[in-house]
């Protein structure tokens, strides 16, 4: 078993709105549970968009999720990384970071 | 969308090797996954390898294994292949295309340079 | 490898007339991820080709929506619902869930 990376970035979206996505990348096996949580509880399936999950050519893989939120309300939001057994929990950088 | 800007063409001899270059402008080239493709004149295309930007992993059709070598350069964000041990079968044009793994399209080839021909003949 | 087997080889047609050409793949193209890379390209003379659909139905950006992508298992279909002139060219389907991925031969939609 390899564990996952797990990077969060953020990016502008339209006014007053930041897209963040979650990156998991080098992990095995395959099966992954990678989802974005508000206040401790996941978001509906359509208010994310999920990366397929795909080989990186290491013999590993990757994928990702990512989510529009208002910008201000990142303190909320946590990416949520579940792999063989192991999981972790994964802010939203602040601004500067 | 971006360019990918190719290498010009390729007289080269039989037994020699070339290197194409792919140049790349507009994207987050290390979020790419990078593929070479081959076609003769009035044929179909094939799929040579890919090299994911971001790691440098690759992964090879086996039949071009022992005659293309993908790598990658971050900093001047370039995709290269090297066709080693050229014959008359290997003349043919090639192409890039890379598949933007954050974004939204799930296609390997979304965004294509113009091709490179490679001519081989004594 | 998995063999994709386009039909027909030519396709004549007239302006504003309904285009179908088929694509047959070997075995299932399902990926491991469970999506299906079942992709449709379009190459005029001298240049690149052009991603047209990907994943068996969904249009790149910029594709009109005469142009649409169906199918299951082994058995896909490009359909163009009212060809135009800048439609004529060699199509192509490709699978890129299998390694080696693998092109069909390619139809030609040319003018009656």
């Known amino acids: 078993t390899v564990p996952p990376m797990v990077n969060v970035t953020r990016s502008n979206a339209s006014e007053g709105n930041i897209t963040v996505t979650c990156r998991a990348s080098s992990f095995y096996p395959r099966n992954i549970i990678l989802t974005w949580r508000q206040d401790n509880v996941s978001l509906s399936n359509d208010t994310q968009q999920w990366g397929d999950v795909l080989p990186d050519g290491n013999g590993t893989y990757q994928t990702w999720v990512a989510t529009r939120i208002c910008r201000g309300e990142e303190q909320n939001f946590t990416c949520y990384m579940e792999h063989s057994g192991n999981h972790s929990t994964h802010p939203v950088p602040s601004n500067g970071s | 969308q971006g360019q990918m800007q190719q290498s010009g063409a390729e007289l080269v001899k039989p037994g020699a090797s070339v290197k194409l270059s792919c140049k790349t402008s507009?994207?987050?080239?290390?979020?790419?996954?990078i593929s070479w493709l081959k076609q003769k004149p009035g044929q179909s295309l094939e799929w040579i390898a890919w090299?994911?930007?971001?790691?440098?992993?690759?992964s090879y059709n086996q039949k071009f294994r022992d005659k293309a070598q993908l790598t990658v350069d971050t900093s001047s964000r370039t995709a290269y292949m090297q066709l080693s041990s050229l014959t008359t079968e290997d003349s043919a044009i090639y192409y890039c295309?890379?598949?933007?793994?954050?974004?939204?399209?799930?296609?390997?080839?979304?965004?294509w340079g113009r091709g490179t021909l490679v001519t081989v003949s004594a | 490898d998995v063999l994709m087997t386009q039909t027909p080889l030519s396709l004549p047609v007239s302006l504003g007339d309904q285009a179908s050409i088929s694509c047959r793949s070997s075995?299932?193209?399902?990926?491991?991820?469970?999506?299906?890379?079942l992709e449709w390209y379009l190459q005029k003379p001298g240049q690149s080709p052009k991603l047209l659909i990907y994943k068996v139905s969904n249009r790149f950006s910029g594709v009109p929506d005469r142009f649409s992508g169906s199918g299951s298992g082994t058995d896909f279909t490009l359909k163009i619902s009212r060809v135009e002139a800048e439609d004529l060219g060699v199509y192509y389907c490709?699978?890129?869930?299998?390694?080696?991925?693998?092109f069909g031969g390619g139809t030609k939609v040319e003018i009656k």
């Open positions: 507009g994207f987050t080239f290390s979020d790419n996954y």
């Open positions: 075995q299932h193209i399902v990926h491991s991820n469970e999506n299906t890379y």
């Open positions: 490709f699978q890129g869930s299998h390694v080696p991925w693998t």
């Open positions: 295309a890379r598949h933007d793994y954050y974004g939204t399209s799930g296609a390997w080839f979304a965004y």
């Open positions: 090299i994911y930007a971001g790691t440098g992993g690759s």
